[in-house]
Each structure stands twice: as structure tokens, then as C-alpha cells.
């Protein structure tokens, strides 16, 4: 059931009331408005909208709304100087090459400002060599290339196909694998699904179609100049050479048509499998090097990008809380885009700017939730989720104190097909209720609830008659919140369906041709899906605005721990000899793991059982609810990666986009068999289940009855 | 003071089948996730499957299709059962808790 006990209330200002207030046609008008010209991230374009975002949601009823700047590191192709990639003769012709610029789509010809594909954060440079194909440039592809088919990629400039992994963990291997540049592509494969036209007349990829996207390897440390701080006016900014994250071989992303070209000239090996092969009518040869008639030529890259400390503006918006103002529930999405951003981010940001105005409509009426609700327009996500970060860095004292929840609103649609969610364990009961409350969009599941659309197309692998929910990762704003600051986080869109089309994300993803008309002709023309999620996210927000008792069930995390424990343990014992030899444990983690799933039962028996009334109690119950999350934080953050403080989930170090489970155990046994100190390798195996174990048993702790 | 005792190893024919049983004592045999692993005649030890204390099961590829593992908490006993067996399955099967609690072993020989 809703909640609707905030002041003034009346009847009718419930969550209903709220959900009622959402309307689809508005955010077709807000993705409208959002998406005529390019946003890009430290333009003027972008404070321009920020300016009215700020001005819209005073309109629309908020307490405050401000500007938060931060003067961070951006990436730009230099105007006059455009980045390129050329096949060479022996004599140093360029024989061919690769495109400045991607044909504008029909009616944007004359619109100006749209940055060029670039791989944002590239250093300079003019490399040429023989080329490698190293597939999607993955941790595996570089094993198999170096190990298997004994092939050196120092000094030689690698090919990669964009998909299943962020591109600045691609960039990271090419690097380790000494490379001296890479070539990012889309591949038909990937980004163009069979049967569908390509863009203007369908939502696939055309052949000078480019995907941008920074290539940094931050590991969630935000401005690469100010890690841990704020970018603010009297920062201390690190040398460049200090610069966090920052790669150090130039790189270029291009379309297939450019691809083809380098491509269908390959020699060498033969790829491995058929893994290796993508749709383009070319061996997939993995080189090194053109084939016999063009063996001497090579090709050449030509980067003129520059680093530029360049201000960004986030929107703050705050509607405070009736009950407890010193309690918040952040919903935030950014901004920015790299082109139009039909899709990203401005579908999500059109959602937002509906739910702002839902709720200002509430409070005009005399409503307040509960606790206060931030909304948050965040500047400089694709170079790195810097605004996002900055701002948390900034307000990092009061968020750890304060922050019940944040939930994520980037692009709301990847795809029609069905509802997908990634969020903390605490808040699968949340979702699960308040989708079963939601009416499905759904064709065929014309008055059956979303929770049933949503678990008929996407089950749990583990528990029948329940939907699949994900793992939080990263490649999105809520990082900072969840992974440094141990706040409970969700995300929530509309996404394809992933057994029929294997492409990666969706085609035209971070191209020119992801306008306003790719949304209302092919993905969503009655905008019932982003209504949808427009419910979802809004629907989040006010429960954990609005409900007395924060609805987290600490019980599920119990559960996934269990699972989790079950999964790292299974992947320890591939390695019998040394688990022996090593007298390697888990005894800690699993009596952590019982311990905390005995207290977090007792836990939600007294949550059942208490005075609800006794506004003293209430706020403790409460307060061990917001902080389990924080208990899962180890301050000295995980190897290496100190602003991955989060024991229990950290991005994968293979895929940021990916979550990993117990990851600080993961991280030391993986490829363990190729260290060259077993005793000292698996010694860190034995310290990582150590840091797990105490850390689970510490979290349970905090759910004991305090006296 | 933990335990761990196999049994129900033998000779077998290819393409036979054999039930394994390890029965456990001196920890909640419910709270643990536990494992088999094998040690053909002259070579290391091999990981071949694992059930975690939620009954989640993984196997090694090579075993993948033809070996079952289970648990009965109620009984605290793991079973594995081999199915479509082969002449490389011939080894000692260890019941193994984790990389210090083992069993003594049992011999599986698959042969003609």
C-alpha cells in the first residue's frame, strides 16, 4: 500500500494523487524541448538549459533550486585541426581516409555545434603501424591473443569492435598489451538488428553512424584533476601527468563504412572462432599487418584533441520534508549530452522535469513529503560523471549523515520490450510492490499489472515468479552515491529484449542520430513507456519520501549475501592444490553470512512489532534501515581503488558497466594461476575474505538491538 | 572437531553410473557451502563441483551434463551423482569444505 502520511494532507494527496499528475504528453513536450540543439557538456548551450531547468522547477513549485559549479578537466576536438585516420602507402600518401563527420540526419543539416565523433580524453598524437584486430578488446580477447595464438600487440596500433565492455576498459588492455593507438568501431553485429532499417527510416546504425564516449579509467575518482574533492574556485588541480585516469596512446572511434576498409584488408592469423567474426563481408583476419599486395602499407592516426579545465553547472532542486527535512531522497539524472541526446540523457531528463512538476503540483496544493527530496540535473556525465561527483565530494559530509536513497535517471528507454531494474537488495521488496501497483504498457498485458508483464519477459534466474533484478555497476551517476558513499541507490528504464537482439546498449547510442524523431517514430510514439518509468522512478521516490517506516527489507540482503558467499567460494575452489596448500578458509565469511541473516530476521520482527508512534523509535528503526548500507563501506576502499569503498558490489575491473559481487575477493583470485608469487597471491585471497567476513559481520552488528 | 567421510566409490563400466555420499559433522552443515574435487592416479587435483549453502551448483566443464551435485541438510550429507561415466573420471573423490576441511577420499574406476 501507498503512503500519505505527510502535513496537510488530504485524501486525495496520496501516492495515487502523484502518479494520476504524470502525464505522458508532457514529456513528449519536455523531450522536445530538451533535444532541438546539441547540449554538450561545458558549453554555452548546456548552461543555457541548465538556466531554464532552474527556472522551470521554481515554476513548478520547489522550495530552492541553485546552480552548482565545478571547474573541471573536459576533452574537445580541436575546430580547426580535425582528428582523423589514414591508410598509408610506403611513401607516406594517405591512400584513404576515415570520415571528419557524421551526415547530419534530415532537418538538422543547417545545426551547428555538433561535435565530431572523438574518443573524449584522447592524448595527441600521430601513430602509424600495422594494424591487430583484437575482437571487443576485452580482458579474454587479449589472453587469447597473447597466450593462445602467441600475438604481440606492442608497438602496433589495435582495432577493437565497440559492445559488452565499457570503452575505457578496452583502451586500458590495448594500453597494458602495449599498443601504441586504437581504433574503436561498430560493428553491424553489434549495433545494427536484422530486419530493422537503418536511421532516418528505422532505429539501426548507418554506416557513418560513430559512437563518442570518454575512454577514462577513473575508478570513481570524478575530475580527474581533484580526486576526493571539489572543483571548486580554491582547489588544488594536479599536474597533467597526475591526472587521474587519463589514457596515454591516442584513440578513435569510427563508423563501419571506415571500418570496412581497414578491415577487409587484414592479413595474418585467421580469428580464433567464430566468436571473433562480426557482420561485415571481411575475413576478421587478426593481422598483424594488411595482407600480401598491401603489405606496406600501414595506417596512421592523426589525434589533435585538447584537455581543457572547463566550468560545468549542475541544477539542485530541493523540496523539503514536512517530518524529518534532515533526511534525503535524491533523484538525479544528467544532463549533458554528446550530440542531440535523444535518448541520453534527455529522455530521462524529460522524466525528471514530469516528476518535479508532479510533485510541485502536490505542494502547491498544501502537500510535503515526509523527508526532503533533492532533484538533481547533473552536468558532464559522459566526460566521466563529473558533475554528479563533484557535487557529492562537495556535500559528502552531509550526504553520509543524511542520504536515505538516491535513484538514477539517465535515458528511460534502451528499447520497448520490457521494464529493467538494477538496484540495492534493500530495495527489491520496494520494487516489487510498487510495480505490481503500475499498470503494464505492455501489448498483451492490457490490464495485467507491470510486475507481471515485467516477470513473464524478464524471470529471475533464481526464484520463479519474480522479475530479474540486477546488479548495480557503474557508467552512471549513481556511483558516487553508491559505491563511495554506501547510500542506498536504483535505477530504473524500458529496455529491449536481450535474447532475440544480441546488439550492444541500443544502435545509435552516443550518435548524431539519436534525435527527438528516433524516440517518437521508432522507440515510444505514445510515450507509454517513458510514462512508465516516469511512474516507476517517481513512484520510488515518493515511498522512500513519504512512507513512515523506510521501505528497505534488510532480509533480501541476507539473501543475495548468501548467494554471493556461495558464488566467490565456488570460484576459490577451482584451485583445489592451492586452497589446500594455502589452508584458504571461508568459514568466516559463511559465519558472517548466518550471523547476519539471524540478526536481519530478528530485525524485521521488531520492525513488524513497534511503536510506530513513538517518534524516538520510529528514527532509530529508521536510521539502522538508512545506514546497513553505509556498514557495507571499508573507508580504505578496495586495492587500488580507493573511491570503491563498497565490500559487498564494485564495478567490475574487466567492464565498468558490469557489477561484481564480494569484487575484493574476485579482484585477488582473478587469473591467479599466471602470478608469479602464489604465496603472496594467495595470501591476499585469504586478507580480501577477512575484509568481506568483518565487514558482513560488522553491517549485522548494526542491526542488533542497539541496548 | 570437523568431519568429512565419503563413500560409495567402486568399480564401474563406461557409460555407468555411481552415487557418492559425504556425510558431515562438526559444523552446520546448512551454513557452508561445500565441494567435491578429484585426484586422478599421478596428477593434481581437480575441481569437479560445489553446492552453496543456498543450493546454488556449479560444475567444472568437464563434468558438466553428466555429473549431479546435491545436499540433504537434514541428513548433513553431500551426494554427487555420475552419470554417463568415462575412463577419465577414474580418481579419488574428496568431499572438501574448503582448503583446510577434506575427506579422506574414495576411489571411483571407470573401466572395461
Known amino acids: 500500500k501507498s503512503s500519505n502520511e505527510a502535513t496537510n494532507i488530504t485524501p486525495k494527496h496520496n501516492m495515487k494523487a502523484f502518479l494520476d499528475e504524470l502525464k505522458a504528453e508532457n514529456i513528449k513536450k519536455f523531450l522536445y524541448n530538451f533535444t532541438q540543439i546539441p547540449h554538450l557538456a561545458g558549453t554555452e548551450q548546456n548552461f543555457q538549459l541548465a538556466k531554464q531547468i532552474q527556472s522551470q522547477w521554481k515554476e513548478f513549485g520547489l522550495d530552492s533550486v541553485e546552480l552548482a559549479h565545478y571547474d573541471v578537466l573536459l576533452s574537445y576536438p580541436n575546430k580547426t585541426h580535425p582528428n582523423y585516420i589514414s591508410i598509408i602507402n610506403e611513401d607516406g600518401n594517405e591512400i584513404f581516409n576515415t570520415s571528419l563527420f557524421e551526415p547530419p540526419p534530415p532537418g538538422y543539416e543547417n545545426v551547428s555545434d555538433i561535435v565530431p565523433p572523438f574518443s573524449a580524453f584522447s592524448p595527441q598524437g600521430m601513430p602509424e603501424g600495422d594494424l591487430v584486430y583484437v575482437n571487443y578488446a576485452r580482458t579474454e580477447d587479449f589472453f587469447k591473443l597473447e597466450r593462445d595464438m602467441k600475438i604481440n600487440c606492442s608497438g602496433k596500433i589495435v582495432i577493437a569492435r565497440y559492445g559488452k565492455v565499457f570503452r575505457g576498459n578496452k583502451v586500458k588492455n590495448a594500453q597494458l598489451a602495449g599498443a601504441k593507438g586504437v581504433i574503436l568501431y561498430s560493428d553491424p553485429a553489434d549495433y545494427f538488428a536484422p530486419g530493422v532499417k537503418s536511421y532516418p527510416d528505422g532505429w539501426n546504425l548507418p554506416g557513418g553512424g560513430v559512437q563518442r564516449g570518454n575512454i577514462l579509467n577513473l575508478n570513481g575518482a570524478g575530475d580527474p584533476l581533484t580526486p576526493g574533492y571539489p572543483a571548486n574556485e580554491y582547489a588544488y588541480r594536479r599536474g597533467i601527468a597526475e591526472a587521474v585516469g587519463l589514457p596515454s596512446i591516442p584513440v578513435h572511434p569510427i563508423g563501419y563504412y571506415d571500418a570496412q576498409k581497414l578491415l577487409e584488408k587484414m592479413g595474418g592469423s585467421a580469428p580464433p572462432d567464430s566468436s571473433w567474426r562480426g557482420s561485415l563481408k571481411v575475413p576478421y583476419n587478426v593481422g598483424p599487418g594488411f595482407t600480401g599486395n598491401f603489405s606496406t602499407q600501414k595506417v596512421k592516426m592523426h589525434i589533435h584533441s585538447t584537455n581543457e579545465v572547463t566550468r560545468i553547472y549542475n541544477v539542485i532542486g530541493t523540496l523539503r520534508g514536512a517530518v524529518e527535512p534532515d533526511r534525503y531522497v535524491i533523484l538525479g539524472g544528467h544532463r549533458d549530452s554528446w550530440v542531440f541526446g535523444g535518448i541520453d540523457p534527455q529522455s530521462g531528463a524529460a522524466v525528471v522535469h514530469e516528476i518535479v512538476r508532479s510533485f510541485g503540483t502536490l505542494k502547491k496544493e498544501g502537500w510535503r513529503p515526509r523527508r526532503t527530496i533533492l532533484f538533481a540535473s547533473w552536468d558532464a556525465e559522459e566526460f566521466g560523471l563529473l558533475g554528479s561527483t563533484e557535487w557529492a565530494e562537495e556535500n559528502s559530509r552531509l550526504l553520509q549523515e543524511r542520504g536515505v536513497a538516491y535513484i538514477n535517471a539517465d535515458s528511460s528507454i534502451e528499447g520497448n520490450y520490457t521494464l529493467r531494474v538494477d538496484c540495492t537488495p534493500l530495495m527489491y521488496s520496494l520494487v516489487h510492490n510498487l510495480t505490481k501497483e503500475l499498470k503494464s504498457p505492455d501489448e498483451g498485458f492490457e490490464g495485467k499489472s507491470l510486475y507481471e508483464s515485467w516477470t513473464k519477459k524478464s524471470p529471475s534466474p533464481e526464484f520463479s515468479g519474480m522479475p530479474r533484478i540486477s546488479k548495480l555497476g557503474s557508467g552512471n551517476d549513481f556511483e558516487v552515491f553508491f559505491q563511495r558513499l554506501g547510500i542506498a541507490s536504483g535505477r530504473a528504464r524500458y529496455t529491449k529484449n536481450w535474447e532475440t537482439n544480441k546488439f550492444s546498449g541500443y544502435p545509435l547510442y552516443h550518435s548524431v542520430y539519436e534525435t527527438y524523431e528516433l524516440v517518437e517514430k521508432f522507440y515510444d510514439p505514445m510515450f507509454k513507456y517513458h510514462l512508465t518509468v516516469a511512474q516507476v522512478r517517481g513512484g520510488m521516490v515518493f515511498e522512500l519520501a513519504n512512507s513512515i517506516v523506510l521501505p528497505f527489507d534488510c532480509r533480501d540482503y541476507a539473501v543475495v549475501l548468501r548467494k554471493y558467499a556461495d558464488k566467490i567460494y565456488s570460484i576459490s575452489m577451482k584451485h583445489p592444490q592451492e586452497m589446500k596448500t594455502y589452508s584458504v578458509s571461508f568459514d568466516s565469511l559463511f559465519s558472517a553470512v548466518k550471523n547476519f541473516t539471524e540478526i536481519a530476521s530478528k530485525f524485521s520482527e521488531r520492525l513488524q512489532d513497534f511503536d510506530k508512534s513513538n517518534p524516538i523509535v520510529l528514527r532509530m528503526m529508521n536510521d539502522q534501515l538508512m545506514f546497513l548500507e553505509r556498514a557495507f563501506i571499508d573507508p580504505l576502499g578496495l586495492p587500488d581503488r580507493p573511491f570503491y569503498r563498497h565490500v559487498i558490489y564494485a564495478p567490475s575491473s574487466h567492464n565498468k558497466y558490469a557489477g561484481e559481487s564480494f569484487p575484493g575477493i574476485y579482484d585477488a583470485l582473478f587469473d591467479i594461476e599466471s602470478k608469479v608469487d602464489p604465496s603472496k597471491a594467495w595470501g591476499e585471497v585469504k586478507r580480501q575474505i577477512y575484509v568481506a567476513a568483518f565487514t558482513v559481520q560488522a553491517a549485522a552488528e548494526t542491526l542488533s538491538e542497539v541496548a | 572437531e570437523v568431519q568429512l567421510v565419503e563413500s560409495g566409490g567402486g568399480l564401474v563400466q563406461p557409460g555407468g553410473s555411481l552415487r557418492l555420499s559425504c556425510t558431515v559433522s562438526?559444523?552446520?552443515?546448512?551454513?557452508?557451502?561445500v565441494s567435491w574435487v578429484r585426484q586422478a592416479p599421478g596428477q593434481g587435483l581437480e575441481w569437479v563441483s560445489s553446492i552453496g549453502a543456498g543450493g546454488g551448483t556449479y560444475y567444472a566443464d568437464s563434468v558438466k551434463g553428466r555429473f549431479t551435485i546435491s545436499r540433504d541438510d537434514s541428513k548433513d550429507t553431500l551426494y554427487l551423482q555420475m552419470n554417463s561415466l568415462r575412463a577419465e573420471d577414474t580418481a579419488v573423490y574428496y568431499c572438501a569444505k574448503d582448503g583446510v576441511d577434506w575427506g579422506q577420499g574414495t576411489l571411483v574406476t571407470v573401466s572395461s
Open positions: 562438526g559444523f552446520t552443515f546448512d551454513d557452508y557451502a
